[in-house]
């Protein structure tokens, strides 16, 4: 999906209002310095591409993020503020439901969510408005 035409400010507002708090809840008990952020993004569409990948694509050691509260709210925000996003996700969602197993918060998942926080931070505060 090409995130170029999303309403970035509306997605930012959704993140700051709710999604960020859910990420904090997920990471509760983890020090902010515990994981080193290695995933980066260059602009807002790229950030959303990386956020989508880390949030919804199962990875080795962490297959369980997609049903977390922050993930569901992320999905809702993208569906509302990114034209045509919902249609592209129908097949992916059905496949994900078939794969879904019990919810386990692993250290790998915590590391992945820490990376997500860094991506969202970058999405929210791009230094793109040079005078």
């Amino acid at each position: 999906y090409d995130f170029t035409n999303c309403d970035f400010e509306k997605i930012k507002a959704a993140y700051l209002s709710t999604i960020s708090k859910d990420l904090i809840t997920y990471m509760s008990g983890t020090k902010s310095t515990e994981f080193n952020n290695t995933v980066s993004c260059s602009n807002r569409p790229h950030c959303l591409t990386e956020i989508q990948s880390l949030t919804f694509n199962p990875t080795a050691g962490c297959a369980s993020l997609a049903k977390e509260m922050f993930a569901m709210k992320t999905k809702a925000a993208l569906a509302i503020w990114c034209p045509g996003y919902s249609e592209t996700q129908i097949n992916a969602t059905q496949a994900m439901k078939k794969r879904r197993k019990r919810k386990v918060t692993t250290n790998k998942c915590l590391e992945q969510v820490s990376q997500l926080q860094g991506l969202w931070r970058r999405f929210n505060r791009p230094l793109l408005k040079q005078q």
Epitope: S42, Q117, R121
Partner: antibody
Framework: EVQLVQSGAEVKKPGSSVKVSCKAS????????MHWVRQAPGQGLEWMGA????????SYNQKFKDRVTITADKSTSTAYMELSSLRSEDTAVYYC?????????????WGQGTTVTVSS | DIVMTQSPDSLAVSLGERATINCRAS??????????MHWYQQKPGQPPKLLIY???NLGSGVPDRFSGSGSGTDFTLTISSLQAEDVAVYYC?????????FGQGTKLEIK
């Protein structure tokens, strides 16, 4: 706990340049915007510019654009602010500051400040 | 540039009394329903410290006698019951548009 440690006080001649460093420790460096703010004696706060160390992208206050250069070295977790063509009105305390964890955009960690005095 | 104008420039309030500082932006600092305005406290010889973020949210470790309100162009910082340690200079800051800009500061003293 994240800390920002700045280089020591500088005394410079008008027309010269100064380069102030800001070393981050205790946390991730590359995925946080790092800002530079200055404060002239008895005056308020003035934003100079910022850098995203992850890719070196910068944003500058137009007032300083031709004179200020902000850089970062990811390998040493250090940000730098160089100000050229110094004049007496550049005498100030220069602060580096890091944005918060959540993208709210407030400055939650500050360096101790570096006093730069410009005098002939 | 968005100009931030604080009032008053200085303020003297008795211990235990309410202190109110206003900040007006030359144009709206709101975006998608959120107000991108922060408040800082600065004591002599120290860097600023965050008090309030996004107009009304209390910063981490900040006493709840501090509160913020407002939207659009008009914002207020309130200290409900002034304590001796609140003597400082207070700054508003907008981050909605580059360049980021601060108010000129309000010096708060004890009467």
């Amino acid at each position: 706990e994240v800390q920002l440690v700045q280089s020591g006080a500088e005394v410079k001649k008008p027309g010269s340049s100064v380069k102030v460093s800001c070393k981050a420790s205790g946390g991730t460096f590359s995925t946080y915007n790092m800002h530079w703010v200055r404060q002239a004696p008895g005056q308020g706060l003035e934003w100079m510019g910022a850098i995203y160390p992850g890719n070196g992208e910068t944003s500058y206050n137009q007032k300083f654009k031709d004179r200020v250069t902000i850089t970062a070295d990811k390998s040493t977790s250090t940000a730098y602010m160089e100000l050229s063509s110094l004049r007496s009105e550049d005498t100030a305390v220069y602060y580096c500051a890091r944005e918060d964890d959540y993208g709210e955009g407030y400055f939650d960690v500050w360096g101790q400040g570096t006093t730069v005095t410009v005098s002939s | 540039d968005i100009v931030m104008t604080q009032s008053p420039d200085s303020l003297a309030v008795s211990l235990g009394e309410r202190a109110t500082i206003n900040c007006r932006a030359s144009e709206s600092v709101d975006n998608s329903g959120l107000s991108f305005m922060h408040w800082y406290q600065q004591k002599p010889g120290q860097p600023p410290k965050l008090l309030i973020y996004r107009a009304s949210n209390l910063g981490s470790g900040v006493p709840d006698r501090f509160s913020g309100s407002g939207s659009g162009t008009d914002f207020t910082l309130t200290i409900s019951s002034l304590q001796a340690e609140d003597v400082a200079v207070y700054y508003c800051q907008q981050i909605n548009t580059d360049p980021l800009t601060f108010g000129q500061g309000t010096k708060l003293e004890i009467k």
